[in-house]
């Protein structure tokens, strides 16, 4: 009897009520492998979820998040609200990054600006809520009298004469 069930292909189930005949999966259900005794209920994409791929008799539906949300977890099991760049999602909704932190994405948390001095460098471009600081050469690398905000001269590529 087990052999009869193993002949049932994906998209069907082995119906014990009908002498183990292979019956098609009912509407809104699927079986992705052969030999199944039941079909699984199709995933429904509702609320902030939208359908990326419809359910078929052999494969489950796949969901995405609606505009303004992004997927979290395996197979988009959760949708999280987007924030703007320069913000993070908190217990009060989207909030601006605190001074000294930034977020250059619509998701995730605000991260501290890079501390250039830890690498013996100086700040070339100040950080903002949306962008990290840009570190430049160390103060010692700058010629005497040069400002720490002065960008270094671009390195010349081989074979190119200066402009």
């Amino acid at each position: 009897l087990q052999d009869l069930c193993s002949n049932c292909p994906a998209g069907t189930f082995c119906d014990n009520n009908r002498s183990q005949i292979c019956s098609p999966c009912p509407p809104n259900s699927f079986s992705s492998a052969g030999g199944q005794r039941t079909c699984d209920i199709c995933r429904q994409c509702k609320g902030v979820f939208k359908t990326r791929k419809e359910c078929s008799s052999t494969s489950n539906a796949e969901c995405d998040c609606i505009s303004g949300y992004h997927c979290l977890g395996a197979e988009c099991s959760m949708c999280e609200q987007d924030c703007k760049q320069g913000q993070e999602l908190t217990k009060k909704g989207c909030k601006d990054c605190c001074f000294g932190t930034f977020n250059d994405q619509k998701r995730g948390i605000c991260r501290p600006w890079t501390n250039c001095s830890l690498d013996g460098k100086s700040v070339l471009v100040n950080g903002t809520k949306e962008r990290d600081v840009v570190c430049g050469p160390s103060p010692a690398d700058l010629s005497p009298g040069a400002s720490s905000a002065t960008p270094p001269a671009p390195a010349r590529e081989p074979g190119h004469s200066p402009q």
Epitope: R43, C63, M78, C94
Partner: nanobody, 122 residues
Amino acid sequence: EVDLVESGGGLVQPGGSLRLSCAASGFTFSRSAMSWARQAPGKGFEWVSGIYSGGSTYYVDSVEGRFTISRDNAKNTVYLQMNSLKPEDTAVYYCATWGSQQIGVWHEDDYWGQGTQVTVSS
């Protein structure tokens, strides 16, 4: 069969009040966190408020102090009391289970109501 049915929406003048209700059935309501979301015309879905099974409440900044979420486990109902309503509160309001219990996050297994229209206009 899980069912969430919202009611209480309508037309109200700025500064007025409304109380939305969401009657739940088909699942263990008393153990479920619940949430309210809204979608304004031409805008995206916005998480508005949530309440844990134990009664802890959370709000988005724009409604804090004006809206109050509450629940009655004996009646399997969650409420959203909306005071000092503003034109920008105009939206379809949805009740949903809140499996993630994270602000602005919903889980694939959450259930949703059909929504109730709230219009704030003079």
